[in-house]
């Protein structure tokens, strides 16, 4: 039958927490990023504001996999599902703040918003 | 090591039928959508069919339409290919791909394939 | 149906740079993915994203995409780069591969 629509959930949830366990030096060279609204559209928005960060291993898994959650393709400097830009976070804080909220969608059966 | 390792190939005659099995290993099955691509001999590759992780959609193209059937069982970690009216020109190697993670897993980009079993359809 | 049209061969002397073309309708669009493929072996993901390169994929390879055309780069092209290129992007529902290049490194 139809895969449970968490599963996919689980493994960027997984990435996000081995991202904010293996932080020795800061994240991405402290790089900041718009912060986000964590409402409809957040895979989209989360994609389109860690998309400008580049040369940063660190995070690329996690790009990639949110890719898969966007219908649409997001590029550098794109900004359609970011409505509000007026707030800049560290990368580090991005994740966790990222983390906390993909763990209540996966605790009450979401996936996608 | 994410492994992916196909059986179920050989000869079969025009209008024949052959079921493919992938057997998947190293990775969560569950959460990746698999994929079937075909490579006839001396020619470039042609994806066949997508099987997601997430809602359990299935896609074709056009030349297998109506007579393969992808299937997968993940209490098996094993991705399936029922290919009937088999005709001339469906040999080819036919490999198992893991795809991307998601509802728009085609995003993602198919990171890792297998070696291949190879379908022959003569008579 | 949608069609990714791409040189039959291109050749490069060693340590040379090799450009690969992709063409399709809007292909800018959408994400392309670049593969691989030698002699008897199983295609290799090179490229994702359309500029992405998954680990252990050398930096000599790179790729691009804007408009109607996606381009894969291979800077100071070696002997084991001789292969099979395929692009490929997602269009209504379909994985679509590219016609395929040989690239040829001489000498």
């Known amino acids: 039958g139809p895969v449970p629509p968490s599963t996919a959930l689980r493994e960027l949830i997984e990435e996000l927490v081995n991202i904010t366990q293996n932080q020795k030096a800061p994240l991405c060279n402290g790089s900041m990023v718009w912060s986000i609204n964590l409402t409809a559209g957040m895979y989209c928005a989360a994609l389109e504001s860690l998309i400008n960060v580049s040369g940063c291993s660190a995070i690329e898994k996690t790009q990639r996999m949110l890719s898969g959650f966007c219908p649409h393709k997001v590029s550098a400097g794109q900004f359609s599902s970011l409505h509000v830009r007026d707030t800049k976070i560290e990368v580090a804080h991005f994740i966790t703040k990222l983390l906390s909220y993909t763990k209540q969608l996966f605790r009450h059966g979401q996936q996608f918003n | 090591e994410v492994q992916l390792l196909e059986s179920g190939g050989g000869l079969v005659q025009p209008g024949g039928s052959l079921r493919l099995s992938c057997a998947a290993s190293g990775f969560t099955f569950s959460s990746y959508a698999m994929s079937w691509v075909r490579q006839a001999p001396g020619k470039g590759l042609e994806w066949v069919s997508a099987?997601?992780?997430?809602?359990?959609?299935?896609y074709y193209a056009d030349s297998v339409k109506g007579r393969f059937t992808i299937s997968r069982d993940n209490s098996k970690n094993t991705l399936y290919l029922q290919m009937n009216s088999l005709r001339a020109e469906d040999t080819a190697v036919y490999y198992c791909v893991q795809d991307g993670l998601g509802p728009y897993f085609y995003n993602y980009g198919m990171d890792v394939w297998g070696q291949g079993t190879t379908v022959t359809v003569s008579s | 149906s949608y069609e990714l049209t791409q040189p039959p061969s291109v050749s490069v002397s060693p340590g040379q740079t090799a450009s690969i073309t992709c063409s399709g309708d809007?292909?800018?669009?959408?994400?392309t993915c670049w593969f691989q493929q030698k002699p008897g072996q199983s295609p290799v993901l090179v490229i994702y994203h359309d500029s992405k390169r998954p680990s252990g994929i050398p930096e000599r390879f790179s790729g691009s995409n804007s408009g109607d055309t996606a381009t894969l780069t291979i800077s100071g092209t070696q002997a084991m780069d001789e292969a099979d290129y395929y692009c490929?992007?997602?269009?209504?529902?379909?994985?679509?591969f590219g016609t395929g290049t040989k690239v040829t490194v001489l000498g």
């Open positions: 099987f997601s992780g997430s809602g359990g959609s299935t």
């Open positions: 809007k292909l800018g669009d959408k994400y």
């Open positions: 490929q992007a997602w269009d209504s529902s379909t994985y679509v």
